[in-house]
Interface confidence: medium
């Protein structure tokens, strides 16, 4: 038994043109989730199968609200481990998927918006009981930092957590210091005690009276960060006991090569020599199978049989992106004739039609005066969708069904008198007001 | 694919109670988001209530908050719309839904949602 543990450094746009600004609109404030799903290895189960290692989430991230104009700062991340507790052996080889969503607060139609903003998936070897292990990845135009590790919660021990090691009452065989283990009684096992003042944060160490530093630390103790470190020779070896690392502008300073690559300087920069399962210029991108179930909303996966080879999904009706991660919008094809409202229903497109439109696509114009009559003389007029009736004088209304007082709008200005006529109205003006209306 | 199948629906006075349940299968692992929505005679499927299955962060219309309550067993892949002190205007054909990894979901929008059951009918009379 054991713990799995991720660490996320840093969530943010990509490098590159067209990276965006930042997770959240500046319309609404937003908070960040972390989701983890993990599977042994060689599995060969879709990400639709359960995360048969197990799964976590992190804690809500704290609200963040973009401010137009204000340069991005960093994106306030969620604190804390993402643990991941895993009740048998440790498989040496996993599969992982990292998901990162956005919730957008406050008020809006539809309901508080949810995103998936980007995944990543890959598989790696990692053996319990080792270091963090740093990783870059990329998805679309957003970049992910994080480090994680196995470790075997006690008695557990061992590379796959499969040993189990318990202090005895009976003697043993064993010297002093030393623990015996169970199952094996003349197996004996150091307590792993690192050197004194090793910092437990950035420094670990596989043999006792040993510290060495994680990535950006230095130092006997690595208590050192990079940056800061000094050293008495202008171009010593990289070292954690000697707390040197080869300063200057050497392009494989601080190894730009992600994920175990190896990197070589050339003329002009540096060159990555890239584990199996990766490429890219870093040796960032990760050769994901299809194994690691990459498509989404019932997308096929085809190809991507191992890690070399690029997979390609085929998505259903209504979804698109390389991984069918983004629902296409059909009604952005303007598919409702006549001024009609589109509505994807997700199952469905409906127009919802104009007056006088009809049909799945609003493409039939009714006749508007067909089965409409208008009273008392009126003649129906067809337009804008709808009927309308030109009634004859004294009368009004939609029908043409009302008498109408022509006088009761008030029309003659200035104190005129109204008199309804048949031929329509007549104003009397007030002395010294005059025109049809009494205007003048 | 993911299948829904609702069941629980029927008739009862107004003021009464009733308990839908959905129950998936298929992809369910993808189906971050499960919701109930409904749909009166002649009007818009409208959204009732919904859940981020994965965070147990919820989200409801404004004329049900307080009255319905939208809940899951994850052991048994199913989710349940509790609809207490039922009024006449909540008559409808309910229908459950679930919606996957997306760009966008917004949580009370049925065009967000890929996968629908086939409703259960919910009767309140006066």
């Known amino acids: 038994a054991g713990v799995f543990e991720l660490q996320i450094h840093s969530f943010g746009p990509g490098p590159g043109p067209g990276a965006p600004r930042s997770p959240c609109s500046a319309r609404l404030p937003c908070r960040l989730f972390f989701r983890v799903c993990l599977k042994p290895g060689l599995s060969e189960e879709a990400a639709e199968s359960p995360c048969a290692l197990g799964a976590a989430l992190s804690a809500r991230g704290p609200v963040y609200t973009e401010q137009p104009g204000a340069p991005a700062p960093d994106l306030p991340l969620p604190d804390g481990l993402l643990q991941v507790p895993f009740r048998d052996a440790w498989p040496g080889t996993f599969s992982f998927i990292i998901e990162t969503w956005r919730e957008e607060l406050g008020d809006q139609i539809g309901g508080p918006a949810w995103s998936l903003l980007a995944r990543v998936a890959g598989r790696r070897r990692l053996a319990a009981g080792g270091p963090w292990a740093r990783d870059i990845q990329r998805a679309g135009a957003w970049e992910l930092r994080f480090s994680y590790r196995a470790r075997c919660e006690p008695p557990a021990v061992g590379t796959a957590c499969t040993r189990l090691c318990r202090p005895r009452s009976a003697p043993s065989r064993c010297g002093p210091g030393l623990r015996p283990c169970a199952p094996l009684e003349d197996e004996c096992e150091a307590p792993l005690v690192c050197r004194a003042g090793c910092s437990p944060e950035h420094g670990f160490c596989e043999q006792p009276g040993e510290c060495r530093c994680l990535e950006g630390w230095t130092g006997p103790l690595c208590t050192v960060p990079v940056s800061t470190s000094s050293c008495l020779s202008p171009r010593g070896p990289s070292s954690a006991t000697t707390g040197c690392l080869v300063p200057g502008p050497g392009p494989c300073d601080g190894n730009p090569c992600a994920n175990g690559g190896s990197c070589s300087e050339t003329p002009r920069s540096f060159e990555c020599t890239c584990p199996r399962g990766f490429y890219g210029l870093r040796c960032e991108v990760s050769g994901v199978t299809c194994a690691d179930g990459p498509c989404f909303n019932g997308g096929l996966c085809v190809g991507g049989a191992d890690p070399d080879s690029a997979y390609i999904c085929h998505c259903p009706p209504g979804f698109q992106g390389s991984n069918c991660e983004k629902r296409v919008d059909r009604c952005s094809l303007q598919p409702c004739r006549n001024g009609g409202l589109c509505l994807d229903l997700g199952h469905a497109l409906r127009c919802r039609c104009r007056a006088g439109f009809a049909g799945p696509r609003c493409e039939h114009d009714l006749d508007d005066c067909a089965g409409r009559a208008c009273a008392n003389g009126g003649t129906c007029v067809e337009g804008g969708g709808a009927h309308r009736c030109s009634c004859a004088l004294g009368f009004g209304g939609r029908d043409c069904r009302e008498r109408a007082d022509p006088c009761a709008a008030r029309p003659c200005a200035h104190g005129g008198r109204c008199y309804a006529h048949f031929s329509g109205l007549v104003c009397a003006c007030a002395p010294g007001y005059m025109g049809a209306r009494c205007e003048f | 694919q993911v299948r829904l199948v609702e069941s629980g629906g029927g008739s009862v006075q107004a003021g009464g109670s009733l308990r839908l349940s959905c129950a998936a299968s298929?992809?369910?692992?993808?189906?971050?988001?499960m919701g109930w929505f409904r749909q009166a005679p002649g009007k818009e499927r409208e959204g009732v209530a919904t859940?981020?299955?994965?965070?147990?962060?919820?989200a409801y219309a404004d004329s049900v908050k307080g009255r319905f309550t939208i809940s899951q067993d994850r052991a048994k892949n199913t989710v349940y719309l509790q609809m207490n002190s039922l009024k006449p205007e909540d008559t409808a054909m309910y229908y459950c839904?679930?919606?996957?990894?997306?760009?966008?979901?917004?949580?009370?929008?049925?065009?967000?949602?890929?996968?629908w059951g086939q409703g259960t009918q919910v009767t309140v009379s006066s």
């Open positions: 298929g992809s369910t692992y993808s189906t971050n988001f």
């Open positions: 859940l981020v299955t994965w965070v147990e962060r919820t």
């Open positions: 839904a679930a919606a996957a990894a997306s760009t966008d979901v917004r949580l009370l929008d049925p065009g967000d949602f890929a996968y």
